[in-house]
Interface confidence: low
């Protein structure tokens, strides 16, 4: 039994982690600067998307890049519990805090802000430079989606790395996982064409959910055949002229649920991965 | 002046490097096994490409993956001169060999076979599982293109890493370079749409040359509108029904030179990067 409550311990761990973050701002500032630069570079490359066939390719390309970038950037989250492993074991054994207090304290103070920031920065820079769908809801859905991808990828990193002593093995494992997840995200291969004995793997792909949601959000209601009219070109069956046609060819459900089910899936993955990470920390103290 | 000729030294360095390779076969065998497994996985995912709109997406996707995989796999080439840096300086000072003998010896015995193998394995597995263009010349052009990409990426790795003592900085630099090169390769963004003040960057992208060559090789002469009669539907400006239409939309020159100029560019890059690597080794001995 502990003399202090869960909430008190949570506040204490959060405060300390946050102080460490502010006390060593170079890493945080460097991350922000890199994100801003990358956002501006992407914005410049894709500046002012067209509403023609190149517009389909470029929209899909930039959304894929943002999704996979969120994933691979999240590999750094493996360090969260690894770097402080000895300190955690020492402090836990000394009765400073519960595992749950440490776990949620670290998440709230470190993971939450550091994974939220790139999503906000990317969306704010890229959205207007590219001229993505000009509606407020589409803007915030994109921001929310990128956050969910970052959180689920980071949660996976924690689940793999929690309790380990070295970062490198976890990093390698994460990278391999993300390469395969990337293949199954839906840009490099049309997911409707994969054999049934293999296609189930797509449901374990974090970028697949993020990329699908971003495409649903951006493509719905768009037109990609400039000057197309009903009196001419009316036999043009093979063209992809609307966002709906594009999404259907990608096997994406056009209903609102077709958008939100991706966020539900990512939320489930976050819960599962964080539970695994928590359990690994619990078992760690038993064998320490 | 040396008592032994350049050729004798070259043979001696090559022999020793090759013995080291055979004497420690785990790394080589592991690389081969990983390549075979990855080839089979890619083959299974993309098995039997269709000749419809999904066929365009899947062909472009797999060619992009193979090209970028060749690049990122070549990052490991940074170790070639870094690991043996002290040994090289010691043996060079002791008058064992010329810098040129060591340089070309290492290339012939280590770089040449280890970068050639994945290209051969990938092509042999993937080509037939996917059902790519059924002509012998297309098969060997693909193999040659993948080799050229691997060699130019490895040459870049050597140019960056030669003379350095630690692998990590070179690896990070290479990875960042390849991420930007990957963006400019032509799948994630249609290269014809990039602003002129930025589009020149594509000419420094190794995967861009490889990807363009592979697409030119595969798409030319293909038809992607099943059952489409050439005399009907020709008013449809928006459909991509032939490989030629697809390549044109990507800004790819349809002439034979449109294919071979990519290999010429890669060859030039190999020469430039290897020259830089050689000069760095030359300067290294001056300051050792």
């Amino acid at each position: 039994s502990y003399t202090t409550s869960f909430c008190h311990q949570l506040r204490w761990v959060s405060k300390r982690s946050f102080k460490n973050l502010l006390g060593n701002p170079q890493a945080s500032i460097a991350q922000i600067i890199v994100t801003v630069i990358l956002g501006l570079v992407i914005g410049a490359i894709y500046f002012g998307l067209n509403n023609d066939s190149t517009g389909i390719q470029n929209r899909a390309g930039v959304l894929f890049f943002l999704t996979t970038n969120q994933c691979f950037s999240s590999v750094s989250a493996v360090e969260l519990f690894v770097v402080e492993k000895k300190l955690f074991i020492h402090e836990y054994i000394s009765g400073y805090y519960r595992v749950s207090s440490y776990f949620f304290g670290k998440l709230l103070s470190d993971l939450l802000p550091m994974r939220m920031l790139p999503s906000i920065i990317f969306t704010c820079i890229v959205y207007f430079m590219l001229g993505l769908k000009p509606t407020a809801d589409a803007f915030f859905i994109m921001m929310f989606t990128l956050m969910m991808v970052a959180y689920s990828a980071s949660s996976m990193a924690l689940a793999i790395a929690a309790g380990q002593s070295v970062v490198s093995v976890a990093t390698l494992l994460m990278t391999i996982c993300f390469v395969f997840m990337m293949i199954f995200s839906g840009l490099l291969v049309n997911l409707t064409t994969i054999a049934s004995w293999l296609s189930w793997l797509q449901y374990f792909s974090i970028p697949r959910y993020g990329f699908t949601a971003l495409q649903h959000n951006e493509f719905l209601g768009q037109n990609f055949c400039p000057g197309l009219n009903a009196t001419v070109n009316n036999t043009c069956n093979y063209a992809t002229c609307t966002g709906e046609e594009y999404l259907t060819k990608q096997g994406i459900d056009l209903s609102p649920w077709g958008l939100w089910k991706n966020h539900v899936a990512l939320a489930c993955m976050i819960v599962i991965f964080l539970t695994i990470a928590y359990l690994k920390l619990l078992f760690l103290k038993k064998y320490s | 002046s040396y008592t032994t000729s350049f050729c004798h030294q070259l043979r001696w360095v090559s022999k020793r490097s090759f013995k080291n390779l055979l004497g420690n076969p785990q790394a080589s065998i592991a690389q081969i096994i990983v390549t075979v497994i990855l080839g089979l996985v890619i083959g299974a995912i993309y098995f039997g490409l269709n000749n419809d709109s999904t066929g365009i997406q899947n062909r472009a996707g797999v060619l992009f993956f193979l090209t970028t995989n060749q690049c990122f796999s070549s990052v490991s080439a940074v170790e070639l001169f870094v690991v043996e840096k002290k040994l090289f300086i010691h043996e060079y000072i002791s008058g064992y060999y010329r810098v040129s003998s060591y340089f070309f010896g290492k290339l012939l015995s280590d770089l040449l076979p280890m970068r050639m193998l994945p290209s051969i394995i990938f092509t042999c597995i993937v080509y037939f599982m996917l059902g790519l263009k059924p002509t012998a010349d297309a098969f060997f052009i693909m193999m040659f293109t993948l080799m050229m990409v691997a060699y130019s990426a490895s040459s870049m790795a050597l140019a960056i890493a030669a003379g350095q003592s630690v692998v990590s900085v070179a690896t990070l630099l290479m990875t960042i370079c390849f991420v930007f090169m990957m963006i400019f390769s032509g799948l994630l963004v249609n290269l014809t749409t990039i602003a002129s003040w930025l589009s020149w960057l594509q000419y420094f992208s190794i995967p861009r040359y490889g990807f363009t060559a592979l697409q030119h090789n595969e798409f030319l002469g293909q038809n992607f509108c099943p059952g489409l009669n050439a005399t009907v539907n020709n008013t449809c400006n928006y459909a991509t029904c032939t490989g030629e239409e697809y390549l044109t939309k990507q800004g790819i020159d349809l002439s034979p030179w449109g294919l071979w100029k990519n290999h010429v560019a890669l060859a030039c890059m190999i020469v430039i990067f290897l020259t830089i690597a050689y000069l760095k080794l030359l300067f290294l001995k001056k300051y050792s």
Partner: antibody
Amino acid sequence: EVQLVESGGGLVQPGRSLKLSCAASGFIFSRFYMAWVRQAPTKGLEWVAYINTGGGTTYYRDSVKGRFTISRDNAKTTLYLQMDSLRSEDTATYYCTTLAAPWNYVMDAWGQGASVTVSS
Amino acid sequence: DVVMTQSPSLLSASVGDRVTLTCKGSQNINNFLAWYQQKLGEAPKLLTYKTNSLHTGIPSRFSGSGSGTDYTLTISSLHSEDLATYYCYQYNNGYTFGPGTKLELK
């Protein structure tokens, strides 16, 4: 050949409802934004509402907002205009049209029109 | 909303004449202007869009021009079948038609 055939027009009392239909043929209906345009007797043309390809986005002129509902059934290649709380100023010939390409809202193909008279 | 005005409201011309119809917007409409022709008892027909792009199947005697707030539709040589009411339509800010110009035989 492109054909747009409106139906459902007629005489109706103020405050009552009416539903117009537009059967489309000769083109890929699901690919096009659709719109309703009206023309009051001896008056000019007036844009009423449009709908996007999937039916998820609709847009109305201020005077009909909250009273009129535009919808579509891509499977039946049919466009609808549900008109509630009709007023005398809604009396007009209602045309069903295709939009050439968003975001360029040019009415391209037109139906022959359905006459709606709102009178007590 | 943008208000469109057309002048003249009635125009009399002879077959073979060069006819110019004008349309003025209450604000800049960035060339997002189309012209429609409507004959009695018929639906309107698209002639030009984006100021000067001729719609498919429309004779080349019809041409559009203009910029900013001022636009014109020109019929280089009037045919008897061109007698109708012509409407300009802006789709830059909202969607509004002009009141129309009736073209009749002199």
